[in-house]
Interface confidence: low
């Protein structure tokens, strides 16, 4: 028998520095977690103790903090090289700055293979990108070889900016011939490493003949056997065992997100490359693991540029950006409108001639808007200003909801109106009218939404049975501020870009902004 240790990360999302337990900015260092310096300590410890170790990443290193905003992927290549990753799969967020934003900082600089079997380049891009990412890679490990085959969510064109010269194929269809090819090369130990979410990971384990292990990402799935060490609730045991269609037991793993855990899976293979046993658990990278001093020093050196960036002007406002709780928790506020407009703008993807865009709607809890911005400071808007407006370090995500769920959400928005509570919704691509003289649960008297399948966008009444795409904060997607109906009834959830980054990019693009209060939210009675 031959034993392999797979160390894995996924959905790190720019958390190069240690973070708080909830993966936001580290405040109290003695209770902080993760970060590349701490990760390196643990990886090195395992490399010294065990003979056959692979360090793999399942995508979405890009996007999530000011590190990515400033360094645009160069930081990912630099620190992944320093940690000596063995392979990485492309995630959807690796395309956030377009194909060029992937090629130059990451693909050309990485000293490890970057993989995806279901992304096919065409046209002029095919020769430009040739060899910079691969469908698979055969890695020598000790006296053996291991095949790693990559995959990426086929939804990427809806979630990011891969352009028109990359085709995202069905994962299973694309993986099978690559695995077959590896078999003909006498590679009998094959890991599928990819970024399509836990449900697809399980399907790959079930359907792709010859895959021995699946290491996934995208869904931020936390798996754990036994008593979990922090606040994440396991979606199942680690590893999650899938019985393949040809009767094999295939371990499937994922390691939550944000570099909080290091996935640790030990696999025992027989001489024919069959998995005899698999066991392990994610390792919580808490403060009991010291940060490696050399990596930490490097982080501090790279940090200097971030501090300078946060005080630079992104753009100007010529109006007061009213982010006060007195406004945003009671009525339409222009800060809410600005943020929602930025959220929609960030999700412009012209992927189908029938649609002007795939999504037109935004909702945003008023309680998530934590500060106004005064235009009297020369109109200057900085990252620092935006960090006061959006301090919680969330993401703006894409969900699919039925009209009936949206209706419930808007009823919840005003079910206890007047108490300055955070659930009052700010909107984009939505016109809502409330009648507060009616009983809670029956206060939405008009709810019109902006069409997407139209050449001239206009507002139509919400249809209860129709499925709509909506951009919203991850806080709401996870049921925050009492929006349990969203969490319970959403049909799809894809994590998006860092909230501050979305707004800062929009302001930089617009240069001068002047959001107005324009009748998105109305009250049919009272003096609101």
């Amino acid at each position: 028998a031959w034993e392999l240790t797979i160390l894995h990360t996924n959905d790190v999302h720019s958390r190069l520095e240690q973070t708080s337990e909830d993966s936001s900015k580290c405040v109290n260092a003695s209770r902080c977690m993760g970060g590349v310096a701490r990760l390196f300590t643990k990886v090195q410890q395992i490399r010294r103790a065990e003979p056959n170790v692979l360090l793999l990443d399942a995508g979405d290193q890009y996007q999530g903090t000011i590190w990515f905003t400033v360094y645009k992927g160069a930081e990912v290549a630099h620190f992944m090289n320093a940690l000596r990753y063995d392979a990485m799969a492309l995630g959807n967020h690796e395309f956030d700055n377009g194909v060029e934003g992937l090629i130059e900082p990451l693909l050309k600089e990485a000293k490890f293979p970057i993989l995806s079997a279901n992304i096919k380049a065409k046209g002029p891009l095919a020769s430009q990108i040739s060899g910079l990412y691969l469908p698979y890679k055969v890695l020598p490990v000790g006296d053996e070889v291991v095949g790693i085959v990559g995959y990426t969510s086929k939804e990427t064109p809806f979630l990011s900016n891969p352009g028109t010269n990359l085709v995202f194929e069905d994962e299973i269809t694309a993986l099978q011939p690559e695995v077959d090819k590896l078999k003909t090369l006498n590679v009998n130990k094959i890991i599928a490493l990819g970024h399509s979410g836990f449900e697809m990971d399980k399907l790959i384990a079930q359907k792709v003949r010859g895959v021995d292990v699946v290491v996934g990402g995208h869904s931020n799935t936390f798996l754990y056997t036994g008593n979990p060490p922090s606040k994440e609730v396991p979606a199942g045991k680690y590893p999650f065992i899938v019985t393949s269609d040809d009767g094999r037991k295939v371990p499937v793993v994922q390691a939550y997100a944000f570099g909080k855990y290091l996935g640790y899976l030990k696999i025992e293979f027989d001489e024919r490359g069959n998995v005899i046993s698999s066991h392990g658990n994610p390792i919580l990278l808490n403060s009991s693991i010291p940060e490696d001093p050399s990596i930490k020093a490097d982080i501090n050196k790279w940090r200097i540029k971030l501090d300078n960036y946060s005080t630079q002007e992104l753009g100007k406002t010529i109006v007061y950006l009213d982010g006060s709780s007195q406004s945003c928790r009671f009525r339409e506020c222009n800060m809410g409108n600005l943020i929602c407009d930025a959220m929609i703008n960030n999700n412009l993807r012209h992927t189908d001639e029938m649609f002007w865009n795939h999504v037109s709607m935004c909702i945003l809890n008023g309680g998530g808007i934590r500060s106004p911005i005064d235009e009297r400071n020369n109109g200057t808007i900085t990252w620092e200003n935006l960090a006061a407006v959006l301090p919680f370090g969330g993401t703006f995500d894409l969900v699919q909801l039925k009209g009936s769920t949206l209706k419930k959400a808007f009823e919840h928005s005003v079910h206890r109106y007047g108490q300055s509570t955070g659930e009052f919704l700010q909107v984009g691509g939505i016109h809502v009218v409330y009648d507060l003289s009616r009983k809670p649960g029956d206060r939405v008297v008009k709810l019109d939404v902006l069409c997407t399948k139209c050449r001239v966008p206009s507002y139509d009444p919400l249809k209860m049975d129709e499925v709509y795409k909506v951009i919203l904060p991850n806080f709401l997607a996870n049921g925050g501020d009492g929006f349990q109906m969203i969490k319970d009834e959403l049909l799809r959830h894809d994590s998006g870009d860092q909230d501050i980054n979305v707004v800062s990019t929009y302001i930089s693009k617009m240069k001068v902004i002047y959001p107005a209060v324009e009748g998105r939210i109305k009250f049919s009675t009272g003096s609101h």
């Epitope: 109290n28 709780s325 006061a388």
Partner: antibody
Framework: QVTLRESGPALVKPTQTLTLTCTFS??????????VGWIRQPPGKALEWLAH???????YYNPSLKSRLTISKDTSKNQVVLTMTNMDPVDTATYYC???????????WGQGTLVTVSS | EIVMTQSPATLSVSPGERATLSCRAS??????VAWYQQKPGQAPRVLIY???YRYSGIPARFSGSGSGTEFTLTISSLQSEDFAVYFC????????FGQGTKLEIK
């Protein structure tokens, strides 16, 4: 590490105004996301939340006591002040200040200060 | 006001045994519930937040469950230092606490 300490009079007369100060260390109320609240507990009874204040001056009060309460902060001194007007013997309680987490639960508490209302 | 009702008012259990404390909310508070332990002369300390998440440093014998209106705090194997008063608190609306359950040695 995070510490909070309450200070104020041990005895107040009925109808008087109570002023309590919470002095804290280990965090700053100018940091985005921080909040400090006040909770009281009459002898042998349950806890009752009174008020809290966020770093951005956002203030919340218990609706049943709102007319009597004022909360404020002095960021430079790391202090939060609660005033309660028109004190009554039923307001006799131990008054705690606590750091409010993102949602309204309290991870760090002061040791409490007993306030007796009596003539 | 959301009223939190705890039961029983007093619970007598032997060391090493399991203790189950209940808390009922007067309306749906989803999972926005915390549990605190308080010993005589001391401030409360948080054990559980968001109904089921153990706070940092809290022993694994403490666990929370429930959502909506019914919540439970379970102490799997009582240690001598666990005998105290336990309060639940909702934070779906402005915070309100239960009246407490006194856990005493049988």
């Amino acid at each position: 590490q995070v510490t909070l300490r309450e200070s104020g009079p041990a005895l107040v007369k009925p109808t008087q105004t109570l002023t309590l100060t919470c002095t804290f260390s280990g965090f700053s109320l100018s940091t985005s996301g921080m909040g400090v609240g006040w909770i009281r507990q009459p002898p042998g009874k349950a806890l009752e939340w009174l008020a809290h204040i966020w770093w951005d001056e956002d203030k919340y009060y218990n609706p049943s006591l709102k007319s009597r309460l004022t909360i404020s902060k002095d960021t430079s001194k790391n202090q939060v002040v609660l005033t309660m007007t028109n004190m009554d013997p039923v307001d006799t309680a131990t008054y705690y200040c606590a750091r409010r987490e993102r949602w309204a639960w309290f991870a760090y508490w002061g040791q409490g200060t007993l306030v007796t209302v009596s003539s | 006001e959301i009223v939190m009702t705890q039961s029983p008012a007093t619970l007598s259990v032997s060391p090493g045994e399991r203790a189950t404390l209940s808390c009922r909310a007067s309306q749906n508070v989803f999972t926005n519930v915390a549990w605190y332990q308080q010993k005589p002369g001391q401030a409360p300390r948080v054990l559980i937040y968001s109904a089921s998440y153990r706070y940092s440093g809290i022993p694994a014998r403490f666990s929370g469950s429930g959502s909506g209106t019914e919540f439970t705090l379970t102490i799997s194997s009582l240690q001598s230092e666990d005998f105290a008063v336990y309060f639940c608190q909702q934070y779906n609306s402005y915070p309100t606490f239960g009246q407490g359950t006194k856990l005493e040695i049988k």
